[in-house]
C-alpha cells in the first residue's frame, strides 16, 4: 500500500564515468522495520512471476547473501529511516533507473531514482545577473549538479584564462532535496571587462581539468574617452592657438552626446569632438575635459591642464600688519599673478632697492621706526617683468623718543619763584596726546607739555615728565636745585651735658637742617648785642652774669634765618648773703624785730640756718627770723647760712641792738 511508504531523495542524480554517486535518501515504513532491500538497475516488473527483473546491484536479505557488486555499491541506510546509497566508482552503464525494492513483514515497495552518468565530466553552468554595470558589484554563480563524498572536486574562476584574484565561496549540498556543488564570486567589473571571457573550470582534487563553462561579459559603461591636445604639453603663451581632440575608446551602449568642460563648467556651443581655442588669454588657463554621454550616463576624459603663460601682472604689496608696533614682526607679500610663477622678486623700500630680498615674501622679525615707509615690489619670470605699483605704506608706531624735561627759568631757582618746565621729545608715532608729571602736585598746566609751579617749595627736588601717545615714555628726572635760606636754625648746648654750673666750660652750637647754597655765616647775639660769628659760642668759665637769652643767626646768599631765643641758665651756690633787719638794727625792747637772710642763688635757697654771736645755730630755718617781743638780751651779732642744690653760703655778722624802753629805764 503506497500510502504506507514515504520516500525523500533527489529525483535524478548526475555523475560521470569513474566518479561516484552519493544518493541521500530517507523513508518511512509505517508497518514495521525493513526486512529485505534489493537495489535494481533498470528494474522491470514481470507479470508472470509477479516479481521485478533486472540487474541486482545490491541485495540485503535474511539469509545474508551479498552479490559481488556489494563493494562498489553500499547501502548506508537502516531498517526504518535511512535509505542512503553510495556507488563508487560509478560507470557509464550505471545510467538509467535505480530501483529500491523494499519489503517489510507485510508490505513491499519499489522506489525509483534516475541516475545520469556521462562518459566525460559534464560542464558546470555559469549564472550571470540580467545586467552588469561597471563598478557595481555582481555575484557570478557557477553551479554543478554533482557532489559526492568519495570524489572531491573544485571549481575555479578564470578571466581571459587567468585565475581571478577575488575570493570565491564554494558550497556543496548533499541533501534529500538537492545534490550540487556551487561557487559564488563577488566581483566589481570595470568597463575594461566588457567583452572579456569568464570561465568556471571544474577540477579534480589535484587540480586536473575536468570540464568548464564560459560566458562573455557584457558590461554596460559610460563612454571611455581619451583627450589629445596640441601642443602636447598644453603649455602656451597668450595669443597662441590650442586644439583639443576627444576620442571614444569604448562605449556600451553607443554614445549620444558630446560636450566640453573647463574647470568643471560646460563650455557653450562646443558639441563636437574637437575644441579649437584661438588666441588664448590667461583666463583660458584651466582644466579641460570632454564629456560624452550614453544611456548609462556621462563619461569624462582625463583633465588636460592648459597653462597659458604670461608675464607677471602688475604687482601689489600686502602688509601684515600695518600699522605695526615697534619691536613686532611684519611680513610683506608681493602679489603678482604670473605663469610660470615668478622666478625673482625685487623689493624696494622708499624707492631704494632692498638688497638680498628676492623672495615673494619679506619678513622683518623686529620692526624699528626706520622701517616705516613705502614698500613696493616687482616680479619677474621668463616672459618678462611686471609693472611695479606705487607700493604700500608701512606705518610703524612707537612710544615717544628721547623725552626730556626742560626748565625754562633762568637759574638759579629760589624758593617762592614761579617755575616753568616743558616736556620735550624727539619723535613720536602716533602723535603725543597727553603728558604726565611726577611727583603729582597742585600745579597748573597752562598748555600741553608745559608745567607751571607757583611759589616753588624749598623741597621740590626733582621733576620728571612723560610724553604719551598709546604709550608713555618717561624722561629722566630733572633737579630743580631750588635755593633757599637756611632752615630750622636752633641753639644747641654741646657742653656740659648736664646743667650749667657757675665756673663750668660751656659750648653752644648754632644748628640748621639745610641750606642751599651750602655756604653760610653765623651770628650770635644776646639782648641785641653781637657776641660772635662762629657756629659755636664758647665760655671758658661761665658766670651767673652770662645767663640770659641767646639767639643765633645763619645766613646764605638767599637770606638769613634766626633761631628761637634760647635761655642760658647758670646754677650757683648762694652768694652775697646779708642779714637785713627791720625795722632797723636798733630796736626797743618789747617791739618786734625781723631779721631777713637775703641772698643771690640759682636755684633759690632751699634751706636757711641762723646763727648767733656764739655761732650757735638757732632753731629757725626760714628766710625770716622774727623776734617778738624783742628782749635786750637778744642784742648781739647774727649771721645766716643759705643752702641750695649747688652749695652753701654765709652772710657776714650783723649786729642787733635792743635798748631798754622808757618804762624799764623809768623803773630803774
Amino acid at each position: 500500500d503506497s500510502s504506507k511508504w514515504v520516500f525523500e531523495h533527489p529525483e535524478t542524480l548526475y555523475a560521470w564515468e569513474g566518479a561516484c554517486v552519493w544518493i541521500p535518501c530517507t523513508y518511512r515504513a509505517l508497518d514495521g522495520d525493513l526486512e529485505s532491500f534489493i537495489l535494481f538497475h533498470n528494474p522491470e516488473y514481470n507479470k508472470n512471476t509477479s516479481k521485478f527483473d533486472g540487474t541486482r546491484l545490491y541485495e540485503s536479505t535474511k539469509d545474508g547473501k551479498v552479490p559481488s557488486e556489494q563493494k562498489r555499491v553500499q547501502f548506508l541506510g537502516d531498517k526504518n529511516k535511512n535509505c542512503t546509497l553510495s556507488i563508487h566508482p560509478v560507470h557509464l552503464n550505471d545510467s538509467g533507473q535505480l530501483g529500491l525494492r523494499m519489503e517489510s513483514k507485510t508490505e513491499k515497495w519499489m522506489e525509483r531514482i534516475h541516475l545520469n552518468v556521462s562518459e566525460r565530466p559534464f560542464p558546470p553552468h555559469i549564472q550571470l545577473p540580467p545586467e552588469i554595470q561597471e563598478s557595481q558589484e555582481v555575484t557570478l554563480t557557477c553551479l554543478l549538479n554533482f557532489s559526492c563524498y568519495g570524489y572531491p572536486i573544485q571549481l575555479q574562476w578564470l578571466l581571459e584564462g587567468v585565475p581571478m584574484r577575488q575570493a570565491a565561496v564554494t558550497s556543496t549540498s548533499l541533501t534529500i532535496k538537492s545534490v550540487f556543488t556551487r561557487s559564488e564570486l563577488k566581483f566589481s567589473p570595470q568597463w575594461s571587462h566588457h567583452g572579456k571571457i569568464v570561465t568556471c573550470q571544474l577540477q579534480d582534487a589535484d587540480g586536473k581539468f575536468l570540464s568548464n563553462d564560459t560566458v562573455q561579459l557584457n558590461v554596460k559603461h559610460t563612454p571611455k574617452l581619451e583627450i589629445k591636445v596640441t601642443p602636447s604639453d598644453a603649455i602656451v603663451r597668450e595669443g597662441d592657438s590650442v586644439t583639443m581632440t576627444c576620442e571614444v575608446s569604448s562605449s556600451n551602449p553607443e554614445y549620444t552626446t558630446v560636450s566640453w568642460l573647463k574647470d568643471g563648467t560646460s563650455l557653450k556651443k562646443q558639441n563636437t569632438f574637437t575644441l579649437n581655442l584661438r588666441e588664448v588669454t590667461k583666463d583660458q588657463s584651466g582644466k579641460y575635459c570632454c564629456q560624452v554621454s550614453n544611456d548609462v550616463g556621462p563619461g569624462r576624459s582625463e583633465e588636460v591642464f592648459l597653462q597659458v603663460q604670461y608675464a607677471p601682472e602688475p604687482s601689489t604689496v600686502q602688509i601684515l600688519h600695518s600699522p605695526a608696533v615697534e619691536g613686532s614682526q611684519v611680513e610683506f607679500l608681493c602679489m603678482s599673478l604670473a605663469n610660470p610663477l615668478p622666478t625673482n622678486y625685487t623689493w624696494y623700500h622708499n624707492g631704494k632697492e632692498m638688497q638680498g630680498r628676492t623672495e615673494e615674501k619679506v619678513h622683518i622679525p623686529k620692526i624699528l621706526p626706520w622701517h616705516a615707509g613705502t614698500y613696493s615690489c616687482v616680479a619677474e619670470n621668463i616672459l618678462g617683468t611686471g609693472q611695479r605699483g606705487p607700493g604700500a605704506e608701512l606705518d610703524v608706531q612707537y612710544p615717544p623718543k628721547k623725552v626730556t624735561t626742560v626748565i625754562q627759568n633762568p637759574m638759579p631757582i629760589r624758593e617762592g619763584d614761579t617755575v616753568t618746565l616743558s616736556c620735550n621729545y624727539n619723535s613720536s608715532n602716533p602723535s603725543v596726546t597727553r603728558y604726565e608729571w611726577k611727583p603729582h602736585g597742585a600745579w597748573e598746566e597752562p598748555s600741553l607739555g608745559v608745567l607751571k609751579i607757583q611759589n616753588v617749595g624749598w623741597d621740590n627736588t626733582t621733576i620728571a615728565c612723560a610724553a604719551c601717545n598709546s604709550w608713555c615714555s618717561w624722561a629722566s628726572p630733572v633737579a630743580l636745585n631750588v635755593q633757599y635760606a637756611p632752615r630750622d636754625v636752633r641753639v644747641r648746648k654741646i657742653k656740659p651735658l648736664s646743667e650749667i654750673h657757675s665756673g663750668n666750660s660751656v659750648s653752644l652750637q648754632c644748628d640748621f637742617s639745610s641750606s642751599h647754597p651750602k655756604e653760610v655765616q653765623f651770628f650770635w647775639e644776646k639782648n641785641g648785642r653781637l657776641l660772635g660769628k662762629e657756629s659755636q659760642l664758647n665760655f671758658d668759665s661761665i658766670s651767673p652774669e652770662d645767663a640770659g637769652s641767646y639767639s643765633c643767626w645763619v645766613n646764605n646768599s638767599i637770606g638769613q634765618t634766626a633761631s628761637k631765643a634760647w635761655t642760658l641758665e647758670v646754677l650757683y651756690a648762694p652768694r652775697r648773703l646779708r642779714v637785713s633787719m627791720s625795722p632797723g638794727d636798733q630796736v626797743m625792747e618789747g617791739k618786734s624785730a625781723t631779721l631777713t637772710c637775703e641772698s643771690d642763688a640759682n636755684p633759690p635757697v632751699s634751706h636757711y640756718t641762723w646763727f648767733d654771736w656764739n655761732n650757735q645755730s638757732l632753731p629757725y630755718h626760714s628766710q625770716k627770723l622774727r623776734l617778738e617781743p624783742v628782749k635786750v638780751q637778744h642784742s648781739g651779732a647774727y649771721w645766716c647760712q643759705g643752702t641750695n642744690s649747688v652749695g652753701k653760703g654765709r652772710s657776714p655778722l650783723s649786729t642787733l641792738t635792743v635798748y631798754y624802753s622808757p618804762e624799764t629805764i623809768g623803773r630803774r
Partner: antibody
Framework: EVQLVESGGGLVKPGGSLKLSCAAS????????MNWFRQAPEKGLEWVAY????????YYADTVKGRFTISRDNAKNTLFLQMTSLRSNDTAMYYC???????????WGQGTSVTVSS | QLVLTQSSSASFSLGASAKLTCTLS???????IEWYQQQPLKPPKYVME???????STGDGIPDRFSGSSSGADRYLSISNIQPEDEAIYIC?????????????FGGGTKVTVLG
C-alpha cells in the same frame, strides 16, 4: 568734494626760484601719494615729481632732478614744489595731482602758470 | 622702453559709438593704464583705470556711456551715444617704477570731434 588749489606761480627770470603750493581739501590728505605734473603751451602732459603719503618715497623726472624739491605738510594739508635754477623750458602750467589706485591720477587742480623769461 | 601709442584724431557722428585705442609696447602688454579727458584750457580729467583683463574703474562723475576693454597690448576706451560735451583730447597714461626711478608716460592723445 575733493579740491586741489595751486598757488605761487608767476614770472621769474632764468636761474631764479619759485615755490608752488597746493592746498588740498575734501579728503584725508595723508592717505594719498601726490604728484606735480606740467604742460607746456601747446605741448603734452609731463610728470614732474611724486611724494608718498608719509614723505618716505620721493621721485623726480630726470629733467628736474637736483633743481626741484617736492615736499608736503600733512598737518596743513599742503603740497609744495620748490623750484630753483629755473630754465625757459620749465615754462608751463603746473598741476597738483592726487594719485589713487595703481597709478590713477584721479584729481587734478586747476593749475598755476609758471613763466621763465628774461 | 615703456611707450603708449594713440592715433592723433578721430571723428564720430553725434549719438554714434566711438572706440579709441591705446597700444602698449609689446613687453608691457600686462600693464594697467589710465584714460584722461582734456578739454581746451582745462586740466585733464581722470576717466578710468583699465586692466589687461578689461576690468576697469571709472572716475567720479564719468557717465556710464564710457567703458573700457582690452585685447593683448591694446587698451580701448569706448563711448556709446557720443555727445557734444565728449569732444576733447583723450590721453592714455601709464606708470611704472623701474629700478629706483618712477616714470609716468602719456600717449600722444587722440583728438575726438563730434559731428552734427
Amino acid at each position: 568734494e575733493v579740491q586741489l588749489v595751486e598757488s605761487g606761480g608767476g614770472l621769474v627770470k632764468p636761474g631764479g626760484s619759485l615755490k608752488l603750493s597746493c592746498a588740498a581739501s575734501g579728503f584725508t590728505f595723508s592717505d594719498y601719494g601726490m604728484n606735480w605734473f606740467r604742460q607746456a603751451p601747446e605741448k603734452g602732459l609731463e610728470w614732474v615729481a611724486y611724494i608718498s603719503r608719509g614723505s618716505h618715497t620721493i621721485y623726480y623726472a630726470d629733467t628736474v632732478k637736483g633743481r626741484f624739491t617736492i615736499s608736503r605738510d600733512n598737518a596743513k594739508n599742503t603740497l609744495f614744489l620748490q623750484m630753483t635754477s629755473l630754465r625757459s623750458n620749465d615754462t608751463a602750467m603746473y598741476y597738483c595731482v592726487r594719485m589713487a589706485g595703481y597709478y590713477a591720477m584721479d584729481y587734478w587742480g586747476q593749475g598755476t602758470s609758471v613763466t621763465v623769461s628774461s | 622702453q615703456l611707450v603708449l601709442t594713440q592715433s592723433s584724431s578721430a571723428s564720430f557722428s553725434l549719438g554714434a559709438s566711438a572706440k579709441l585705442t591705446c597700444t602698449l609696447s609689446s613687453q608691457h602688454s600686462s600693464y594697467i593704464i589710465e584714460w584722461y579727458q582734456q578739454q581746451p584750457l582745462k586740466p585733464p580729467k581722470y576717466v578710468m583705470e583699465l586692466k589687461k583683463d578689461g576690468s576697469h574703474s571709472t572716475g567720479d562723475g564719468i557717465p556710464d556711456r564710457f567703458s573700457g576693454s582690452s585685447s593683448g597690448a591694446d587698451r580701448y576706451l569706448s563711448i556709446s551715444n557720443i555727445q557734444p560735451e565728449d569732444e576733447a583730447i583723450y590721453i592714455c597714461g601709464v606708470g611704472d617704477t623701474i629700478k629706483e626711478q618712477f616714470v609716468y608716460v602719456f600717449g600722444g592723445g587722440t583728438k575726438v570731434t563730434v559731428l552734427g
